[in-house]
Every structure is written in structure tokens, then in C-alpha cells.
Interface confidence: low
């Protein structure tokens, strides 16, 4: 009790004249504080009942107080409706009138708020977004609602938070609470695991071509999780891309074009919340030479009785570094001419008259000859021969 007793000794005379010493105890009560003063800074916690959709206000006091008209049990005021004010008159025998009039400003219903993961899937490997959403209307003044988040040692007083530059595949715990007029009325905790990150870059060990139509690439896989590889190879403007099994560390490229530069790119990817591609490792090689294809549209035309004009079109596939056209002229099985030009345009003069010739034109790319295009053509008899005859009489 706040009242306290003081003991004092007094001497009085009795009627007989003898002195009698008696001890009396006098209670002196210093003034009690008013309940209004005593409970001026009382704090309240609100507890929500999801079944009844009503709140209980828990009064943070050390003694069991009385609540006037509102009954309170164990310092709890029950059955409070959301967003409605309730007035509670708080008294106790340790304080005097006037009582503390406490206005309970009841918060909105807890289920009207939902903690929502607002992380963009594209960025879910390194960011977390959390946001309180109002999913139903209420009549409370939204100005009086404040939000608080704590993620690790970071504290935010926002309705929405965005954490950036996080580690992929890591768990982060965030606690959050909502306060109404600075009274906490709901909280939530979320453990969020960031998404798989982009895989690292594969390490190409070698990438080469040792034949005209084949190449090979070998690599070490990246360290981080991934599902598959994509291998692309580009020749000139044509790009081929192939999905490869994650367990492969080597791929043989077939059906390549001879003497052609191929640029290869290899990246790993993972299909997580979205597909994430790792950085591509690049390399290139040039395939070996091969025989060129045949020249085409070859023509042999006579320019005189014993002269020919041989022409042809370039091969479709040169397949090598250089460009040279060859013409072989045979009579019977005897090679009578062997010419080489930059262009397929040959003028063959001074052949034998009235003779069958075989003309073989082919392309040489510096490494290989192509298949010859073969035409047969005969020279004429010498139409000018009669001018040279002398008649003797």
C-alpha cells in the first residue's frame, strides 16, 4: 500500500496522578496520486480473434485494475469491434479520482492485411520485395497505420520494402508488424529463398577443327547450378544453336563447311522462376580445306578452224584459300595443252585441224583440285588450205 504508519511515544497523566506511559500508533496517509496521473502513459496491445473477428485490448499495467462500465478481466478488455472507439474508465485502490479515461482506438481487422511477395521473377535471384496489401476495406483512418520491417539488422518503416544485391540461393528472414496509432496489432514473418542465379561462364578447354567438315569443342562446366547448355555456332550470317545435356563436356560438330570460319558460343542456362542464361564463352576455328566443287556451265566454241574459246562458271564451293582455273586439252591420250588462269576464260589457238580434242576444266583452291568438267570438241579441216595449192600445167 502507498499509505504508511509512523509510531510515536506520548506521556499523559492519569486521574490518580500517577504517570502512565502509553504507546499509540497514529496512521498518517500521504496524498495518493490520481488514477488519471498514475495511468497517464498506459500502453495497450491488441489481440485479434479470427473466429469472432473481435479484438481484446491488453492493458500493460502491473496491478489488476477496474474498468468502470466495461468489464475487464485480468487487465483485458474483450469484444472490441474493429475501427470503433471504446472508452474505458481505469481505477484502482492505489489512486484517487479522477479515473483515467482511456480511449481505445480499435485497429482494423487483421485479416484485412496480407503480406505479399512482390518480387519480380526476373530479379528474384538477387532481390526481395515484400509489401503489405489491404485486401478488404475498413473505416479506420489509414493515416494512423504504420508499417515496420526488420530483415536481418536492417529496419524499414515502409509499407513496401525492396532488398537488392542479395546472394542467389540464400534464405533471408524478414519480420514485419503493423501498428495502429503506434499500437502493434498484427505481425508476420517470412523466410524467402532467393532464386537460382545465372550460371557462371563455362571454361572452354579447346575448340578446333582438324578436318574439312568437323570441329570439336571441350569445356569445363560452370560452378553454379544449371540445367543445360546452349551451343551456338555462327558462320557468316547463319547461326545454329543446339541445346546440350548438362553432363556433356565435349561436342563434335559435324557437317561443317570446309575452309570456313566458325565462331562458337557456349552458355549454361537454368530454368528457375524464369530462364536465366549464364555468360557465354566464345571461341572460333577455321575448318580445313577440301576439294572444290565442279566448275559449271562450261562451253567450248570455235573461233577459227583450229582455235577454241573455253569458258566456265566458278564452282559453288571453293573450299580453300586460292582461286585458279586449269584447262587441260588432250588429243587421244596425249596432253597437248595445260593452261592456268585467274578466270575461267581460255583461248586455245593453233590446234591440229580435223582433230578430236578433250577439254577438261577444273578449279584449284591452292590445296585441292576439283572434279574436272569434260567436253569433247573437234577442230575443222583447214578451210583456207585451197588458197595455198599451186596448180602446175
Amino acid at each position: 500500500s502507498d499509505a504508511y504508519l509512523n509510531a510515536s511515544e506520548t506521556t499523559t497523566l492519569s486521574p490518580s496522578g500517577s504517570a502512565v506511559i502509553s504507546t499509540t500508533t497514529i496512521a498518517t496517509t500521504p496524498s495518493k496520486p490520481t488514477c488519471d496521473e498514475k495511468y497517464a502513459n498506459i500502453t495497450v496491445d491488441y489481440l485479434y480473434n479470427k473466429e469472432t473477428k473481435l479484438f481484446t485490448a491488453k492493458l500493460n499495467v502491473n496491478e489488476n485494475v477496474e474498468c468502470g462500465n466495461n468489464t475487464c478481466t485480468n487487465n483485458e478488455v474483450h469484444n472490441l469491434t474493429e475501427c470503433k472507439n471504446a472508452s474505458v474508465s481505469i481505477s484502482h485502490n492505489s489512486c484517487t479520482a479522477p479515473d483515467k479515461t482511456l480511449i481505445l482506438d480499435v485497429p482494423p481487422g487483421v485479416e484485412k492485411f496480407q503480406l505479399h511477395d512482390c518480387t519480380q521473377v526476373e530479379k528474384a535471384d538477387t532481390t526481395i520485395c515484400l509489401k503489405w496489401k489491404n485486401i478488404e476495406t475498413f473505416t479506420c483512418d489509414t493515416q494512423n497505420i504504420t508499417y515496420r520491417f526488420q530483415c536481418g539488422n536492417m529496419i524499414f518503416d515502409n509499407k513496401e520494402i525492396k532488398l537488392e544485391n542479395l546472394e542467389p540461393e540464400h534464405e533471408y528472414k524478414c519480420d514485419s508488424e503493423i501498428l495502429y496509432n503506434n499500437h502493434k496489432f498484427t505481425n508476420a514473418s517470412k523466410i524467402i529463398k532467393t532464386d537460382f542465379g545465372s550460371p557462371g561462364e563455362p571454361q572452354i578447354i579447346f575448340c578446333r577443327s582438324e578436318a574439312a567438315h568437323q570441329g570439336v569443342i571441350t569445356w569445363n562446366p560452370p560452378q553454379r547450378s544449371f540445367h543445360n547448355f546452349t551451343l551456338c555456332y555462327i558462320k557468316e550470317t547463319e547461326k545454329d544453336c543446339l541445346n546440350l545435356d548438362k553432363n556433356l563436356i565435349k561436342y563434335d560438330l559435324q557437317n561443317l563447311k570446309p575452309y570456313t570460319k566458325y565462331v562458337l558460343s557456349l552458355h549454361a542456362y537454368i530454368i528457375a522462376k524464369v530462364q536465366r542464361n549464364g555468360s557465354a564463352a566464345m571461341c572460333h576455328f577455321t575448318t580445313k580445306s577440301a576439294p572444290p566443287s565442279q566448275v559449271w556451265n562450261m562451253t567450248v566454241s570455235m573461233t577459227s578452224d583450229n582455235s577454241m574459246h573455253v569458258k566456265c562458271r566458278p564452282p559453288r564451293d571453293r573450299n580453300g584459300p586460292h582461286e585458279r582455273y586449269h584447262l587441260e586439252v588432250e588429243a587421244g591420250n596425249t596432253l597437248v595443252r595445260n593452261e592456268s588462269h585467274k578466270n575461267c576464260d581460255f583461248r586455245v589457238k593453233d590446234l591440229q585441224y580435223s582433230t578430236d580434242y578433250t577439254f577438261k576444266a577444273y578449279f584449284h583452291n591452292g590445296d585441292y583440285p576439283g572434279e574436272p568438267f569434260i567436253l569433247h570438241h573437234s577442230t575443222s579441216y583447214n578451210s583456207k588450205a585451197h588458197h595455198h595449192h599451186h596448180h602446175h600445167h
Partner: nanobody, 127 residues
């Protein structure tokens, strides 16, 4: 495992048209290149047409050039072959196939580059 179901074949007069469809089930083929091949009785299998994963690139064999059109609908997991100005030499069993290739040039003309094959649909062109 992917199952490919080709349909739309039948008997048609020379000069007529047909549209073949190939529906994939078992898994999505939206990231795969798709192709059509054909095999006439007693002949080698022949490349007809191919299309890359998103339809941006198409490839045609010599026989199909200018007359046939390949297309795809990734939402339906289906690839189509529209065949116009049909000739008797187009008579064959037409097969659709799915490749691991996402895009492809020369690679898509090679049957060996295709992983999954349909059961084929017969096209008969009468003169």
C-alpha cells in the same frame, strides 16, 4: 518423352492443296526446331521443310521451294505444312520431327539432327 502425331494427309488431285499438322504431346516443343521429311516408296528419306523455335527462320528443300509453307503455333504445340500446287511426285509418307536445335541452317536439313519422329501421314497426289 515427346510424341508427335502427324495428320492431314489424304488423296488429292494434281494442282490441289493439303495442310498437314503435327501435334506434340509429352512435353513442350516450343524451344525446339521442327521439320517435315518425306519418303516415297523405294526412295531415300528427303528433307522438305524446317522451322526454327520461334518461327523466325524457315528452311525448304529443293522440292518444296515456292510451293510449300511451314509454320508453327507454339501455344498449341503444333507445326503445319501447307502444300500447294501438288504434283504426282509429291506422293509420299510425310513425317514430322523435333530437333534439339533451337535454330539451324544446314543442320536442320539433316534427318540425323532430329531426336523425335512422328508416325507419318500418307499424301497421294493423283494425276
Amino acid at each position: 518423352q515427346v510424341q508427335l502425331q502427324a495428320s492431314g494427309g489424304g488423296l488429292v488431285q494434281a494442282g490441289g492443296s493439303l495442310r498437314l499438322s503435327c501435334a506434340a504431346s509429352g512435353r513442350t516443343v516450343s524451344s525446339d526446331a521442327m521439320g517435315w521429311f518425306r519418303q516415297a516408296p523405294g526412295k531415300e528419306r528427303e528433307f522438305v521443310a524446317a522451322i526454327n523455335w520461334n518461327g523466325a527462320s524457315t528452311y525448304y528443300g529443293d522440292s518444296a521451294q515456292g510451293r510449300f509453307t511451314i509454320s508453327r503455333d507454339n501455344a498449341k504445340n503444333t507445326v503445319y505444312l501447307q502444300m500447294n500446287s501438288l504434283k504426282s511426285e509429291d506422293t509420299a509418307v510425310y513425317y514430322c520431327a523435333a530437333s534439339d536445335w533451337v535454330v539451324g541452317g544446314i543442320s536442320l536439313m539433316n534427318g540425323a539432327e532430329y531426336k523425335y519422329w512422328g508416325q507419318g501421314t500418307l499424301v497421294t497426289v493423283s494425276s
